[in-house]
Amino acid sequence: AVNGTSQFTCFYNSRANISCVWSQDGALQDTSCQVHAWPDRRRWNQTCELLPVSQASWACNLILGAPDSQKLTTVDIVTLRVLCREGVRWRVMAIQDFKPFENLRLMAPISLQVVHVETHRCNISWEISQASHYFERHLEFEARTLSPGHTWEEAPLLTLKQKQEWICLETLTPDTQYEFQVRVKPLQGEFTTWSPWSQPLAFRTKPAALGKDT
């Protein structure tokens, strides 16, 4: 038997993946657990095996179909259960009625690239991955630039309040190495959260032109 409180949190990537984390502060010894997804009106259900991510939390990804297929919409409710094996039977450890479009977390933006770089500015573009057509243009982005001698946590956040998949970074220092990251969030959903940060894009500004001798 398992004692203690548990937390069961899931997010939908807006296409064909529900990622779940289950935390349990009681001890679970060599117990096999899984997440089971049962939509209210779809003719499929799905299961994934919970794998440990720390001493008291487990995670898994429910793969609902091909990455870009629209497996759930705003009309769906999915019953999500954590099931753990107890001898020959399964015990329900946690349950929630999950509204996918109220619990969104998109995939991190991809394909970051430098479009144009100068001494003091750099134009960068990116793409969103596996994002539903339902959002149309209702997305926002946050970006951050890592300057030499600083940490990511110290980097100021730049907010793009519209679906804009590029940014022009200004007031950069010439001949300097920088890194850049971006993340995305739909405007929809009460419990929607930011995507993970993208993989960092490294770039270097151009050196300043040498002044003429006087």
Epitope: D40, R41, S69, Q70, T73, H133
Partner: antibody, heavy 116, light 107 residues
Framework: QVQLVQSGAEVKKPGASVKVSCKAS????????INWVRQAPGQGLEWMGE????????NHNEKFQGRVTMTRDTSTSTVYMELSSLRSEDTAVYYC?????????WGQGTTVTVSS | DIQMTQSPSSLSASVGDRVTITCKAS??????VAWYQQKPGKAPKSLIY???YRYSGVPSRFSGSGSGTDFTLTISSLQPEDFATYFC?????????FGQGTKLEIK
């Protein structure tokens, strides 16, 4: 086997209300949305709304908001659809249908005639 | 609301013919489209869900395809019992909507 059996034909006067029943059998009643769809004579299909018997959750077509009431009785596995303030344009066959995949099983239909 | 525009509205064909009915959604509906067959005085009968999945008991001559905004119902070889009216239906977002129907008649 899955069956949805609806109540009989009704004749109503304008301004009155009608309550149509849909009794489900052959599956777990609480688990699947029951939708209501109507079809005026010689016309297409029009979605009115849906109810999830287990929770009582309801979604309406805004066109009918305020005029349609959907309820359920889990003890008899029956769903009800009441339409008020009837007018001649509400003359139609009213169907209940289960949503699983799409509308997979349909009731036989209930003819509602609104006439003065 | 999402409009489902079906074409043609009526169609004359013969037994053995291959028939195609199309449905165009006014917005992207993914694959959340179904097809129904209705005969006079009867309730609709479910044929296809999720654009291309046949319900059990539906003959293999019925097939559906499409995604996004363009959908097709194909009857590969018409049988006498196939003469009826066919409706497409989107259940991607509220309110659910139907095409206006295609009446398939004997030539």
């Amino acid at each position: 086997q899955v069956q949805l059996v609806q109540s009989g034909a009704e004749v109503k006067k304008p301004g009155a209300s009608v309550k149509v029943s849909c009794k489900a059998s052959g599956y777990t009643f609480s688990r699947y949305w029951i939708n209501w769809v109507r079809q005026a004579p010689g016309q297409g299909l029009e979605w009115m709304g849906e109810i999830l018997p287990g929770s009582g959750s309801i979604n309406h077509n805004e066109k009918f908001q305020g005029r349609v009431t959907m309820t359920r009785d889990t003890s008899t596995s029956t769903v009800y659809m009441e339409l008020s303030s009837l007018r001649s344009e509400d003359t139609a066959v009213y169907y209940c249908t289960r949503h699983y995949g799409s509308f997979d099983y349909w009731g036989q239909g209930t003819t509602v005639t609104v006439s003065s | 609301d999402i409009q489902m525009t079906q074409s043609p509205s009526s169609l004359s064909a013969s037994v053995g013919d291959r028939v195609t009915i199309t449905c165009k959604a006014s917005q992207n509906v993914g694959t959340d489209v179904a097809w129904y067959q209705q005969k006079p005085g009867k309730a609709p009968k479910s044929l296809i869900y999720s654009a291309s999945y046949r319900y059990s008991g539906v003959p293999s001559r019925f097939s559906g395809s499409g995604s996004g905004t363009d959908f097709t119902l194909t009857i590969s070889s018409l049988q006498p019992e196939d003469f009826a009216t066919y409706f497409c239906h989107q259940y991607s977002s509220y309110p659910f909507t139907f095409g206006q129907g295609t009446k398939l008649e004997i030539k």
